[in-house]
């Protein structure tokens, strides 16, 4: 019961996490900044992985997609890749874990197969969560690095004077959504891996016994009890018939014509 609960909870937590990773990837608010230092209008800029948006004090908002791939920073491309890999792995993990759920019966699927599928999906969730956390962290680092590099340096070029305005771009909501979602997916994956241990076929709680034919009437008691003859009492609990019952550990490797399996 505990195994089913752990597996089910792991699945739900991972599902929420992957939904969060998808949401974060699609969100525009990865970085945000108020640009008040102009005489026309107060401007609020926010940027995502796919487009940059500007919202004015009037409420007007314009978003422009990053249509060029060549002009984009390599770090942004890396973040995109990490998030997409995280989503793909998570989606496959979800698909696998649905069939692995103990509460769902599909044909005559063995517990060992479900255990393997649970472990596979768990590992996928862990990698998916790590990808999301890594992607969000790389983007956050990019924002911090950009701030320290843009120390209001002014330079003159073909088009006149260009001034890099040093203003701090703050972490957008998408970063926090991504971190939390990645963490949840990671936790869900760990739970699935833990559940896998409980799903694996359990060893029998008694040792298998091999029987040897004998002329005596021998009472065989599995579970480690010594076999005793039906004649008289064995008050001192001595080993009366050594050739009778043996545990698998004690059985010799060479075959015997008297052995019964």
């Amino acid at each position: 019961m505990a195994v089913t609960a752990c597996q089910g909870l792991g699945f739900v937590v991972s599902l929420i996490g992957i939904a969060g990773i998808i949401a974060a990837t699609c969100m525009d608010q990865w970085s945000t900044q108020d640009l008040y230092n102009n005489p026309v209008t107060a401007v609020f800029n926010y940027q995502g992985l796919w487009r940059s948006c500007v919202r004015e004090s009037s409420g007007f908002t314009e978003c422009r997609g990053y249509f060029t791939l060549l002009g984009l920073p390599a770090m942004l491309q890396a973040v995109r890749a990490l998030m997409i890999v995280g989503i793909v792995l998570g989606a496959i993990g979800l698909l696998v874990s649905i069939f692995a759920l103990k509460c769902i019966r599909i044909g005559s699927m063995e517990d060992s197969a479900k255990a393997n599928m649970t472990l596979t999906s768990g590992i996928m969730f862990i990698v998916s969560g790590l990808c999301a956390i890594a992607g969000v962290s790389v983007f956050a680092n990019m924002l911090v690095t950009n701030f320290w590099m843009s120390t209001a340096n002014m330079y003159t070029g073909m088009g006149g004077m260009v001034q890099t305005v040093q203003t701090r771009y703050t972490f957008g909501a998408a970063l926090f959504v991504g971190w939390v979602a990645g963490g949840l997916t990671l936790i869900g994956g760990v739970m699935m891996c833990i559940a896998c241990r409980g799903l694996a076929p359990e060893e029998t709680n008694y040792k298998a016994v091999s029987y040897h034919a004998s002329g005596h009437s021998v009472a065989y008691k599995p579970g480690g009890f010594k076999a005793s003859t039906g004649f008289g009492s064995n008050t001192k609990n001595k080993k009366i018939y050594d050739g009778g019952a043996r545990t698998e550990d004690e059985v010799q490797s060479y075959p015997s014509k008297h052995d019964y399996v």
């Epitope: 900044q33 026309v40 401007v43 940059s52 942004l76 701030f147 843009s150 001034q163």
Partner: nanobody, 119 residues
Framework: QVQLVESGGGLVQPGGSLRLSCAAS????????MGWYRQAPGKQRELVAG???????NYGDSVKGRFTISRDNAKNTVYLQMNSLKPEDTAVYYC??????????????WGQGTLVTVS
């Protein structure tokens, strides 16, 4: 790198008209604000007119009713239509744009200036 190309300046008689244009090119994500400033000899640089992406405009007191600013967002270009020009409008006119040029960075870019002489 972001470049600005200004054009349209020149010599005009009082009461005449001129149209200035300024096109931005380079790595541009958004241009929230585009505008024109001017600097007459011996004076400080002052705002002539500015326009946001959404069309919000702001004009300097001395040009209200005479100058009209407009922009083409698709072409990243701003225009300044100057009517009823006066000798005191003589100055170097500078294009100014606020450009979102990358992730977590924006630039304030100034053009090299175009001279407008009203005489």
């Amino acid at each position: 790198q972001v470049q600005l190309v200004e054009s349209g300046g020149g010599l005009v008689q009082p009461g005449g008209s001129l149209r200035l244009s300024c096109a931005a090119s380079g790595t541009i994500f958004n241009i929230p604000v585009m505008g024109w400033y001017r600097q007459a000899p011996g004076k400080q640089r002052e705002l002539v007119a500015g326009i946001s992406t959404g069309g919000t405009t702001n004009y300097g007191d001395s040009v209200k009713g005479r100058f009209t600013i407009s922009r083409d967002n698709a072409k990243n270009t701003v225009y300044l239509q100057m009517n009823s020009l006066k000798p005191e409008d003589t100055a170097v006119y500078y294009c100014n744009v606020l450009v979102i040029s990358g992730i977590g960075s924006h630039l304030e870019v100034w053009g090299q200036g175009t001279l407008v002489t009203v005489s």
